[in-house]
Amino acid sequence: LVPHLGDREKRDSVCPQGKYIHPQNNSICCTKCHKGTYLYNDCPGPGQDTDCRECESGSFTASENHLRHCLSCSKCRKEMGQVEISSCTVDRDTVCGCRKNQYRHYWSENLFQCFNCSLCLNGTVHLSCQEKQNTVCTCHAGFFLRENECVSCSNCKKSLECTKLCLPQIENVKGTEDSGTT
C-alpha cells in the first residue's frame, strides 16, 4: 500500500531533497530555508535564491522549512512544577524539565507535571527514580503499597486490594477482636 501523501508532501516530493515546489509555478524548485529562518518570499525563478529571514525573538524553526512564520517558543508551565532546562533559540524550542529528585508524569502527549520521587520509607527501592518514572518500591512485611507509599497494614480495610498482602495481619486483628469474653 502506498501511504497517502498530503498536498504539501506531494508537492515537495517532486523536487530534490532540500527544495520545494514554488506554490505559483510547479516547474520551479526553490531551496528551503535553513533552521532558524522562515520563508519571506519564494525564489523568483530556477537557480535563484529563496528569500529567508531569521526568526524573531520568541520564535524558532528547528529544521529546514518553507514556513511563512516561525513557531512560537514554548513556555515552561510553572503551575506544573516545570523548570527551564534550556531557553529558546532561533533554531531550538525551549526545553522544560523537572528539578532534581523529581520525575515527569505525562497527563497527555504535550503536558507533563513534576512530582517528587518516592523515598520508599518502610520499604526498599526496587527501581530507582527515572526522568519519566517514579521510584518503584517494595514494601516491608506488615506494609502495603498505596499511591506509591508503603502504608501500615493496620490501615488496610477489608474492601481494599491490600487484603491479600495484609491477610496475616487482618486475621490477627480479627482474632483479637473475636476473642472477647461472652
Epitope: 513556555k75 508551565r77 510553572k78 503551575e79 506544573m80 508524569h105 497527563w107 507535571q113 512530582f115 517514579n134 499511591e147 506509591n148
Partner: nanobody, 119 residues
C-alpha cells in the same frame, strides 16, 4: 472538607454548545490550579484543560483547542468550561478537580456531569 460540584451537562446536538460549572468549597479556591478532565464510555481519564489561579495561560488538550474555553471566578469560587462546536467524540462524564500535588492521581475531584453529543 473539600467539595466540588459540577453542573450544566446534558444532551446536545453536534455543533451545539454547553457551559459547565463547578462550585467549589472547603479550600482557598483562589490559590489553586483547577482542572477539567473527562471520561468517555469505556475509556480512561483524559485531561481536557486547566487554569492557574491568576487565569494566565490556560492549557487545552489538542482535541478541544479552539472549541473549549476554561475560565474561573475567584469571587464566586466557581470554575467554568464553555464548550462550543461539540462533536460526538466529546461525549463523556466531565469532572472538575484540584491539580494533583502528591502524585499522578486526583485526591479531590467532583462526582461529574454527563455530556452527551448526539443528533
Amino acid at each position: 472538607e473539600v467539595r466540588l460540584l459540577e453542573s450544566g451537562g446534558g444532551l446536545v446536538q453536534p455543533e451545539g454548545s454547553l457551559r459547565l460549572s463547578c462550585a467549589a468549597s472547603g479550600f482557598t479556591f483562589a490559590h489553586e490550579t483547577m482542572v477539567w478532565v473527562r471520561q468517555a464510555p469505556g475509556k480512561g481519564l483524559e485531561w481536557v484543560s486547566h487554569i492557574p489561579p491568576d487565569s494566565q495561560d490556560p492549557f487545552y488538550a489538542d482535541s478541544v483547542k479552539g472549541r473549549f474555553t476554561i475560565s474561573r471566578d475567584n469571587s464566586k469560587n466557581t470554575l467554568y468550561l464553555q464548550m462550543n462546536s461539540l462533536r460526538a467524540e466529546d461525549t463523556a462524564v466531565y469532572y472538575c478537580g484540584l491539580l494533583p500535588k502528591r502524585g499522578p492521581w486526583f485526591d479531590y475531584r467532583g462526582q461529574g456531569t454527563l455530556v452527551t453529543v448526539s443528533s
